[in-house]
């Protein structure tokens, strides 16, 4: 079982390989000096049907380096960064993992593209392994809450409350969504 020639790349090179390309072979992509690699640099020859070989993912691309590009902080609800830090410049990558009791959908890594957006795939999502969710928490008078998403919230996530200036927060500042689908505390109040 073998794979066909690896997908070509413009403005870059492919690591050396011999033919036939055996299942298990890794080929690596790199870009010319003034270009930045967007996407996974390593492709693996695999077989899904034990008959034909295929590459496990699409080839990355080489984008002409844009020194003015910068990408915003990428947020994955239920997840956290395991690699990457600000500032995010063209070609920088960020890799995510999911919190306990969450599983990942999509690709764990994304790259800062010349268009100031993360790609070449969407940000991954972290899905709760528990079917239960906590109901949306109310806003409070003279205060705000920072929820990672709107509406019902998956267990493991939290909401942080804060008060407007001149008001004092009474109660719990951070409320966690429990695996039971219940909140760990009642919303606080903001008092003068």
């Amino acid at each position: 079982i073998s794979c066909g020639s690896p997908p070509p790349i413009l403005n870059g090179r492919i690591s050396y390989y011999s033919t036939p390309i055996a299942v298990g072979t890794v080929i690596r992509y790199s870009c010319s000096g003034t270009f930045r690699l967007i996407g996974e640099k390593s492709l693996l020859c695999i077989t899904k049907d034990k008959v034909d070989g295929t590459w496990d993912k699409p080839a990355p691309k080489c984008e002409y380096f844009n020194k003015y590009s910068s990408c915003p902080e990428p947020i994955v609800p239920g997840g956290y960064k395991i690699r990457g830090s600000t500032p995010y410049r063209h070609g920088d990558s960020v890799t995510f993992a999911c919190k306990t009791n969450f599983s990942m959908n999509g690709n764990k890594s994304v790259w800062c593209q010349a268009n100031n957006m993360w790609g070449p795939t969407r940000l991954p999502t972290c899905v709760s392994v528990f079917p239960l969710e906590c109901p949306a928490l109310p806003m409070i008078h003279n205060g705000h809450h920072t929820s990672e998403n709107v509406g019902s919230i998956a267990p493991g996530l939290s909401v942080t409350y804060s008060c407007e200036s001149g008001y004092l927060l009474v109660g719990e500042k951070i409320i966690n969504c429990l695996s039971s689908g219940k909140w760990s505390a009642v919303p606080p109040t903001c008092e003068e």
């Epitope: 090179r13 050396y16 298990g24 890794v26 690596r28 790199s30 390593s42």
Partner: antibody, heavy 119, light 106 residues
Framework: QVQLVQSGAEVKKPGSSVKVSCKAS????????ISWVRQAPGQGLEWMGR????????NYAQKFQGRVTITADKSTSTAYMELSSLRSEDTAVYYC????????????WGQGTLVTVSS | EIVMTQSPATLSVSPGERATLSCRAG??????LAWYQQKPGQAPRLLIY???SRATGIPARFSGSGSGTEFTLTISSLQSEDFAVYYC????????FGQGTKLEIK
């Protein structure tokens, strides 16, 4: 960090086989590749082959083709290296080493297993 | 197999001084090169990957450079714990190691 714990030292007769194990703990066994690298006394490092456990795909250095078999048991997060038709020049410390995904370099190494081939 | 050649075989340097170790690939390997440190009776330890990226927890005195066929590992100010054997490894086409450079106290 992933910990790799290898089986104990072995003394073997020429012509026999040896099977060394490498148990991984921490991380996800399915998200990395395990290579076997050997080091003869006072010598350098020599790559023997590697397996990607999630796919069950093993590849071998030409020098060892037909004499080495690398397998993995996902249920116990353990990789194995079996070397057959042993000769005295196979006396070495055998290491398992882990590469994250298919990065190409080894972040973590086992403690090594000394295999002595002697009549 | 891509042949990796390290030089010198042995390097004698005084503590506090700079050490420069070389590694040459038999063919172009882009930046697909790693450096390892090995002390007697221990497994190798990853220092540098992708020719110039320091591995987690590796002190800043270790740096790597080069691409194509010529690579260098530099230790800016040698500490007593740095005296060991150093290996380069390519991962352009499968995997192969250099024969090692022994860094000893002068």
């Amino acid at each position: 960090q992933v910990q790799l714990v290898q089986s104990g030292a072995e003394v073997k007769k020429p012509g026999s086989s040896v099977k060394v194990s490498c148990k991984a703990s921490g991380g996800t066994f399915s998200s990395y590749a395990i290579s076997w690298v050997r080091q003869a006394p006072g010598q350098g490092l020599e790559w023997m082959g590697r397996i990607i456990p999630i796919l069950g795909i093993a590849n071998y250095a030409q020098k060892f083709q037909g004499r080495v078999t690398i397998t993995a048991d996902k249920s116990t997060s353990t990789a194995y290296m079996e070397l057959s038709s042993l000769r005295s020049e196979d006396t070495a410390v055998y290491y398992c080493a882990r590469e994250e995904d298919i990065s190409g370099y080894y972040q973590d190494w086992g403690q090594g297993t000394l295999v002595t081939v002697s009549s | 197999e891509i042949v990796m050649t390290q030089s010198p075989a042995t390097l004698s340097v005084s503590p506090g001084e700079r050490a420069t170790l070389s590694c040459r690939a038999g063919q172009k390997i882009s930046s697909y090169l790693a450096w390892y440190q090995q002390k007697p009776g221990q497994a190798p330890r990853l220092l540098i990957y992708d020719a110039s990226s320091r591995a987690t927890g590796i002190p800043a005195r270790f740096s790597g450079s080069g691409s194509g066929t010529e690579f260098t590992l530099t230790i800016s100010s040698l500490q007593s714990e740095d005296f060991a054997v150093y290996y380069c490894q390519q991962y352009e086409y499968w995997y192969s190691f250099g024969q090692g450079t022994k860094l000893e106290i002068k």
